[in-house]
């Protein structure tokens, strides 16, 4: 089925130009002396988005990011020179790239930057209340940023600041070799993962850190780190990457005799995101790119959304996998990975696991110990040598919820919004790519709510140039999405119901949980508004069922039929442009001969070729004159988008017209034109103008001029016979909807 084959293409594909023209994107295109707008901190209370960039920290107004404040925080000449002397790139590396931006308390943020390969941190005052309008750097108080921000701007930090303590996963050295998970700030001694032990961390790249409660007792709270790292030798043949989830207890203060100032509760497990292959070999998406936690009613059990890409340079693909925290906990309570046997392979540990079980937080809940410093030596020894779990964490339903392998881009970021619709709750995913586009995807149940199907609603280009989307935040309060890249920051609404069209069917076909037909337009759906006229069908997107009683209404309020006249010359070619707004729609053409009511389906062949943009008619004949109707069919619903009247001029007329006397006085034309009716004379005069006019390149421009002149004449001579004006009647009616021959994206929003 052709329509089903189109299911994995975005229904709407909007270029940056179209996004701008329809006011669907606001962009901050960066400052000349800055870049790398990668570090986001959303503050819904103050209605601000804080963004860390190169040498700057910004505070954007969530309502409109064009309204912003900025702090300039560059490095000194000293630091810049030192960095340059170390052989680093003065523009790309020897600057202060902000990597950490966290809320420190009610009045301050904590920020850290690379400091030109000399990490540095400070506090930023933001005031008690939004109306304070304070945004200033505490330049009297700088702190060493080692173990908080990486030295190298190419590396990321996963950070989390809770109760005055900063948890960060980063590289702690100049060379970018000593990767660790740290806890700094606060009143306790800094704590980190074991150094120079590849069993703990093996060249990791940190993605994010999250606090997730384990029980109702805050003492059991854990911090989870998401990262990817090199698989340990023996774990995989050849060099491979594994996606990981790591845990540490919030109340871990290190060991007493061993693992002093090192984590004693660190454990990690592999995150699997794969699809079964034809030969029984799974295709793995191992390169974890981003993670989003969707909070549920139970704070202990958020849903984890992960974006993954393939490691292979040959096969490029992306996937989204969903994980449940109960599955994660099950793995952390399962067998530890242990190296044993003649081949020194990784096997599940079969021996006695010391008590209390390594990875358990010291608390009243699970008994016995008040502090990790009181843990028995055998627990510490075991924890040191068994940081990894044997079993991996599999995604919900054991497969990705979305895969993209047939495209020239890869996924980089994800945020998810839970939307209440007429028939239930839907998760809408906004996925950022490495080419500066955002995909809007909805998970729709097929037979059951467990068996989900992904519907790609829109693909939106949010930056002028292709650029990797490196940060995304979603404001539920503002119903806006904020996107970061090297080039700048973009803001777009989560829903733009009016772009789908002016008819119930179009609104229904969109399958956007945010939108519903309210009786007169496609608008934001609010579950609280109990109106029987609300029409919405996310599960099936079936307009025939939901809008059938409104068809008359639709015809009245729906898009008016676009009509055009096109002139073609016999034996030449002409192109009839018609492409529906929806990429899921099938285009269906009909032909109606002049003075006939009967419409026939156009058969494709050498003479008529169908393209994505429309119909190409080659070697025009007189019999091709007539009406061409372009229809869009989607989900059983058909809509007529365009009626083109084609007039074919025969070559005889044209040759006579072009063949001038030898002496070039054009007497033949005079002679020929004398036998014509007044309207014919006007028409031929206009046609000659087109042929001889050096500045009129296209039929369109010619027609435009005739149309303007015609209108002017009518204004000047009211009540007069209008001569050839009927010829251009359709043209006037459809002028706004006309497209240029060059197929630039200058069209008004198309129907369907």
């Amino acid at each position: 089925n052709y329509a089903n084959g189109k299911n994995n293409v975005p229904r709407l594909k909007l270029s940056y130009k179209e996004m701008l023209e329809s006011n669907n994107v606001i962009t901050f295109n960066g400052l000349a002396n800055s870049s790398s707008y990668h570090t986001f901190l959303l503050d819904e209370e103050r209605s601000r988005l804080y963004v860390g960039a190169k040498d700057h920290i910004f505070s954007f107004n969530l309502v409109n990011i064009k309204d912003f404040q900025k702090i300039v925080w560059p490095v000194s000449y000293t630091r810049r020179d030192e960095c340059k002397w170390a052989g680093k790139d003065i523009l790309k590396e020897c600057a202060n790239f902000i990597k950490v931006l966290e809320a420190y308390n009610q009045t301050h943020l904590y920020a850290c930057g690379t400091g030109a390969f000399h990490p540095i941190c400070t506090y930023i005052e933001v005031g008690h209340h939004p109306e304070d309008n304070i945004f200033k750097l505490q330049d009297s108080h700088f702190e060493n940023g080692r173990g908080k921000s990486p030295y190298d701007p190419k590396l990321l930090t996963a950070s989390l600041l809770i109760d005055g303590e900063l948890y960060s996963g980063t590289a702690a050295d100049f060379m970018g070799r000593d990767f660790a998970i740290f806890r700094t700030l606060g009143h306790h001694h800094p704590i980190r993962t074991e150094q120079h032990d590849s069993r703990w961390l093996n060249d990791p790249r940190f993605i994010s850190a999250h606090l997730i409660p384990e029980s109702d007792n805050p003492e059991d709270d854990k911090v989870y780190f998401f990262f990817r790292e090199n698989a340990i030798d023996g774990e995989h043949s050849g060099k491979a990457t594994h996606a990981r989830i790591g845990q540490i207890c919030k109340n871990d203060f290190g060991g007493h005799r061993s693992l002093v100032n090192k984590w004693t509760t660190f454990l990690k497990a592999r995150l699997i995101c794969s699809v079964p292959g034809p030969n029984g070999i799974d295709t793995h998406f191992d390169e974890l790119q981003d993670v989003f936690l969707m909070n549920s009613k139970d704070p202990k059990n958020p849903i984890v959304y992960g974006v993954f890409t393939t490691s292979s340079n040959i096969f490029k693909g992306s996937a989204v996998c969903m994980y449940s925290m109960s599955d994660v906990r099950r793995v952390f309570l399962g067998p530890y990975a242990h190296r044993d046997g003649p081949n020194y392979q990784w096997v599940p540990y079969q021996g006695r696991v010391p008590y209390p079980r390594p990875g358990t937080c010291p608390s009243k809940t699970f008994g016995g110990f008040d502090s990790t410093k009181d843990l028995p030596d055998d627990v510490i020894t075991f924890a040191r040598s068994h940081p990894a779990m044997y079993n991996p964490v599999f995604p919900i339903n054991n497969r990705p919820i979305m895969i993209k392998t047939d495209v020239n881009y890869q996924f980089t970021q994800i945020v998810v919004d839970r939307v209440d619709a007429e028939d239930g709750q839907y998760d809408v995913m906004f996925i950022g790519t490495d080419v500066g586009t955002v995909l809007k995807v909805v998970s729709v149940p097929k037979e059951t709510w467990h068996d989900l199907e992904e519907i790609l609603l829109e693909e939106m280009t949010v930056f002028r140039e292709p650029t990797t989307i490196s940060a995304m935040e979603l404001s539920t309060k503002q119903q806006q999405l904020y996107i970061g890249s090297t080039a700048g920051v973009a803001q777009l609404p989560l829903h733009r119901c009016d772009i789908y069209g002016k008819a119930c069917a179009e609104c229904c076909l969109a399958r956007d949980p945010y939108c519903a037909w309210d009786g007169s337009s496609c608008s934001r759906y609010f579950p609280t508004a109990k109106r029987r006229t609300r029409r919405q069908d996310i599960r099936n997107g079936d307009p025939l069922t939901h809008c059938s009683d409104l068809q008359h209404h639709d015809n009245h309020h729906g898009p008016s039929l676009e009509e055009r006249i096109i002139y073609g010359v016999e034996n030449s070619s002409t192109f009839l442009e018609c492409s529906p707004k929806s990429q899921r729609a099938l285009v269906y053409w009909q032909f109606q001969r002049r003075n006939e009511d009967r419409k026939e389906e156009i058969r494709m062949g050498d003479h008529i070729i169908r393209t994505e943009q429309g119909l190409l008619l080659r070697s025009l004949q007189k019999k091709d004159s007539g009406n061409y109707l372009c229809h869009a069919v989607e989900h059983g619903f058909m809509q007529t988008l365009l009626k083109v009247t084609l007039e074919v001029i025969d070559t005889e007329h044209l040759e006579e017209l072009l063949h001038k006397d030898d002496d070039g006085d054009g007497s033949k034309i005079k002679e020929m034109s004398s036998s014509m009716t007044p309207s014919q004379k006007v028409w031929y005069r206009d046609f000659m103008q087109l042929i001889n006019h050096p500045n009129l390149n296209t039929m369109d421009e010619f027609c435009e001029q005739v149309w303007k002149r015609d209108r002017k004449q009518r204004r000047q001579r009211p009540g007069h016979s209008q001569g050839s004006s009927n010829k251009w009647k359709h043209m006037q009616e459809s002028k706004k909807g006309r497209n240029r021959r060059t197929h630039e994206f200058e069209r008004a929003p198309r129907s369907v």
Epitope: S76, Y77, T78, D81, E82, K84, W85, A86
Partner: antibody
Framework: EVQLLESGGGLVQTGGSLRLSCAAS????????MSWVRQAPGKGLEWVSW????????YYADSVKGRFTISRDNSKNTLYLQMNSLRAEDTAVYYC?????????WGQGTLVTVSS | QSVLTQPPSASGTPGQRVTISCSGS????????VSWYQQLPGTAPKLLIY???HRPSGVPDRFSGSKSGTSASLAISGLRSEDEADYYC???????????FGGGTKLTVL
């Protein structure tokens, strides 16, 4: 007041080794890159080596590469230069200098004489 | 042979203005900051000018630095007898990945 005090110089045979030290005070030592610069008797200044504030990176002049090793101990506020396979042309006053985009503070120097 | 070229000597009478030149290439002076160092007889060098033309605190404003293209110069106005010293220019050399000094200029106050 910034102070840099070199020690460890002296007379050594060709092919021998020597370890120079530089004790720093009056500034946050662990925050700055440090360097060694030498001056042969009656000659001009020659940069020898420099080390990043956290020892993360070390750089050497071609004339000493592979023979000299720069290091530092931030807990002791001390900079070191381990000199091996010494040659007659290494004879010079060795200055320890604080790096601040240039050499903004210098020690008084320690004389190293390599005799054949 | 030094990478940066300075005249071996310069002289002037008290109160006079003296200029010492330093020429290099695009890999050092052309693209990096120039510093000037003063070395009084029997003492360690002292930073006189940094970042082409800036004076550290404590250095009299009689000393000024400038740079044009791949050349730099140090000007001393109102010359005094205590200015008699060796003067070195220095800059980072990107192609050598090292710091380079001029051969030094011995300034004599007549």
């Amino acid at each position: 007041e910034v102070q840099l005090l070199e020690s460890g110089g002296g007379l050594v045979q060709t092919g021998g080794s020597l370890r120079l030290s530089c004790a720093a005070s009056g500034f946050t030592f662990s925050d700055y890159a440090m360097s060694w610069v030498r001056q042969a008797p009656g000659k001009g200044l020659e940069w020898v080596s420099w080390i990043y504030y956290d020892s993360g990176s070390k750089y050497y002049a071609d004339s000493v590469k592979g023979r000299f090793t720069i290091s530092r101990d931030n807990s002791k506020n001390t900079l070191y230069l381990q000199m091996n396979s010494l040659r007659a042309e290494d004879t010079a006053v060795y200055y320890c200098a604080k790096l601040n985009g240039d050499f903004d503070y210098w020690g008084q120097g320690t004389l190293v004489t390599v005799s054949s | 042979q030094s990478v940066l070229t300075q005249p071996p000597s310069a002289s002037g009478t008290p109160g006079q203005r003296v200029t010492i030149s330093c020429s290099g290439s695009s890999s050092n002076i052309g693209n990096n900051d120039v510093s000037w160092y003063q070395q009084l007889p029997g003492t360690a060098p002292k930073l006189l000018i940094y970042a082409d033309s800036h004076r550290p605190s404590g250095v009299p404003d009689r000393f000024s630095g400038s740079k044009s293209g791949t050349s730099a110069s140090l000007a001393i106005s109102g010359l005094r007898s205590e200015d008699e010293a060796d003067y070195y220019c220095g800059a980072w050399d990107s192609s050598l990945s090292g710091y380079v000094f001029g051969g030094g200029t011995k300034l004599t106050v007549l």
